[in-house]
Interface confidence: low
């Protein structure tokens, strides 16, 4: 079966998260500064005319770009889209931001700058005070807190109203740790790195973040091709060469927000064996309840069968037997020259009475190295509050 069971459709994770309809309370909207109480952070709701019609920072955003508007979503969400406006002021407002940057956090301490798939951080904003400009975030960000940093190319006043669009990230996957993806050299270079990973990279290991293995984009049968437009060969996959792993396996660790009973892990793999990509020969996972605790019990081992000669990409389901843990460490055994994964997701249930590491309160400082990014596709609440999702913008899958 090439499908990921419960795999969410990123195109449908586009619901307004509560600025305009006020389900995000004023107390969850803050800012670095405000020009006056009438342009305070609480006036930054899209299409609102409250106060003087927007949030306006006290200082100039040129040249330092240090002023920000912060929205606390209280729980982890996948934010797929943002919308901005300038200042309303009964139609008399002239202030808006032509461009801005985004920063986001999952724990309130570590902040990451959003970048598009090409590494560009600056987002085109508004051309006038009233028009709403929507920006598809490719890649989307898994965040609890989001900050908007308006920009200007000269000393001038800028003001913002905003909305965020996405859906609840219910899976609980906080991060994954994995070796850095490698480059395969065919007639052209095929870049199998995790190009949207938002954690740290040290000594050939990526840790503490989420990336392409949790972005909802399943790779094609031909790993050189991509679901995305205008990206490089191999973009959808993260891959490792057998030659680089004398152990014969790739080891990954996954960190979740709280104790969960894990039913299965699903790994979307490439099997274009004519070019060296093979499904893993087997998977071995072990479990523990806390970062400093011992691995519990015997590892779960699963040997892969099926039609290994079929070159189509597919989802491999690894049963996990209902084992309870917050951390998983899995080893993926090489069965050929290359392992190529495009997505990893988990089917799990929260263990009752387990205290969340994320939610109303922030988690303890992360243990090094933390685990994997949110990858559970079944973890997204697709239809909050009966809303309809915002339509996809014209053009590329990530606009």
């Amino acid at each position: 079966d090439a499908d990921m069971k419960g795999h969410f459709d990123p195109a449908k994770c586009r619901y307004a998260l509560g600025m305009q309809d006020r389900t995000i309370p004023d107390s969850d909207i803050s800012a670095s500064s405000s020009w006056s109480d009438s342009t305070a952070a609480r006036h930054s709701r899209l299409e609102s005319s409250d106060g003087d019609g927007a949030w306006c920072p006290a200082g100039s955003v040129f040249p330092k770009e240090e002023e920000y508007l912060q929205v606390d979503l209280q729980r982890l969400h996948l934010v797929a889209l943002v919308g901005t406006q300038g200042r309303h002021a009964g139609g008399l407002g002239k202030e808006f931001s032509r461009s801005y940057r985004l920063r986001y956090s999952r724990d309130g301490r570590r902040w990451m700058g959003w970048k598009d798939r090409w590494g560009q951080e600056v987002i085109s904003g508004n051309e006038d005070p009233e028009g709403v400009v929507l920006k598809d975030l490719g890649p989307p960000m898994v965040a609890r807190l989001v900050r908007f940093y308006p920009r200007a190319d000269r000393v001038m006043s800028v003001c913002l109203r905003v909305e965020l669009y996405g859906c609840l990230w219910r899976d609980g996957l906080l991060s994954y740790t994995a070796p850095v993806g490698q480059t395969m050299y065919l007639s052209e270079a095929v870049y199998l790195n995790d190009s949207t990973y938002d954690g740290h990279t040290v000594g050939g290991l990526q840790y503490g973040g989420l990336g392409q293995l949790a972005d909802g984009v399943v790779g094609l049968d031909d790993f050189r091709k991509s679901q995305e437009l205008r990206v490089w060969p191999g973009y959808d996959y993260v891959g490792w060469s057998n030659h680089s792993f004398s152990s014969g396996y790739v080891e990954m660790e996954f960190e979740f927000d709280r104790l969960r009973a894990f039913q299965a892990m699903q790994v979307h793999c490439n099997n274009m064996h004519t070019l060296g990509a093979r499904l893993p020969g087997g998977v071995e996972c072990r479990f523990r309840r806390g970062p400093a605790m011992a691995w519990e019990g015997e590892p779960m081992r699963h040997n892969l069968g099926g039609n290994l000669g079929d070159p189509r990409a597919r989802a491999v389901s690894v049963p996990l037997g209902g084992r309870v843990a917050r951390f998983l460490q899995c080893r993926f055994l090489f069965a050929g020259p290359w392992l190529l994964f495009s997505e990893i997701s988990f089917i799990s249930d929260v263990v009752n009475n387990s205290s969340p590491a994320l939610g109303g309160t922030f988690p303890p400082a992360p243990w090094w190295p933390p685990g994997p990014p949110p990858t559970n596709f079944s973890s997204l609440e697709l239809e909050p509050r009966g809303q309809q999702p915002v339509a996809k913008a014209e053009g590329s899958p990530t606009a």
Epitope: D116, R117, W118, G119, Q120, S124, G138, L229, A393, G395
Partner: antibody
Framework: SLEESGGDLVKPGASLTLTCTAS?????????MCWVRQAPGKGLEWIAC????????TDYASWAKGRFTISKTSSTTVTLQLTTLTAADTATYFC?????????????????WGQGTLVTISS | ELVMTQTASPVSAAVGGTVTINCQAS???????LSWYQQKPGQPPKLLIY???ILASGVPSRFSGSGSGTEYTLTISGVQCDDAATYYC????????????FGGGTVLVVK
Amino acid sequence: SLEESGGDLVKPGASLTLTCTASGFSFSSGYYMCWVRQAPGKGLEWIACIYTGRTDFTDYASWAKGRFTISKTSSTTVTLQLTTLTAADTATYFCARGDYSGGVGGNYWLDLWGQGTLVTISS
Amino acid sequence: ELVMTQTASPVSAAVGGTVTINCQASQSIGSTYLSWYQQKPGQPPKLLIYKASILASGVPSRFSGSGSGTEYTLTISGVQCDDAATYYCLYGGFGSSTGDAFGGGTVLVVK
């Protein structure tokens, strides 16, 4: 502003490097820098662009791949290397800046042009 | 490869009149990728319109652009002598498999 240099009269088969020097703006904020040529009395022909932000991604017209190479050589200069030149490459070569919206890898428009530099191929 | 085909040259217009120049793409493109340029002899091109319909800074409001899909139009209302030039459309889609492409150009003669 943009200023091209390096145009010359050269023989068929020769190579040439054209340079585009920018002033008044920074590549680091992320632009497309493009080369466009115009043969005498003819229309504009797009050659190649390079994205000048954090990563130097390039894009070429199919006919230019392999023979022409665009590079960012500093924070204010972009070059176009021309090889195996023929009489058909005789043209004024313009450097132009592409602004864009919606993130990199998308739409752009050429909002700033240099005056051009003339390349003549003749034996 | 994408081909952009423009109205055949020359196009004539009387001073004060209105003229339209068409640009047809060989396949459907997003309107955000289409821009228009004016070039006078001995000068580099000048940006007029981007994203099919947005007027570039400093360009007189008598110039306007419209279109979607494969058909795009540049309109000059109240044509002036100074508008005599060659006009080009451009599909600018960095990294697209179709390649970026200018139209062949349309010469405007003002009477």
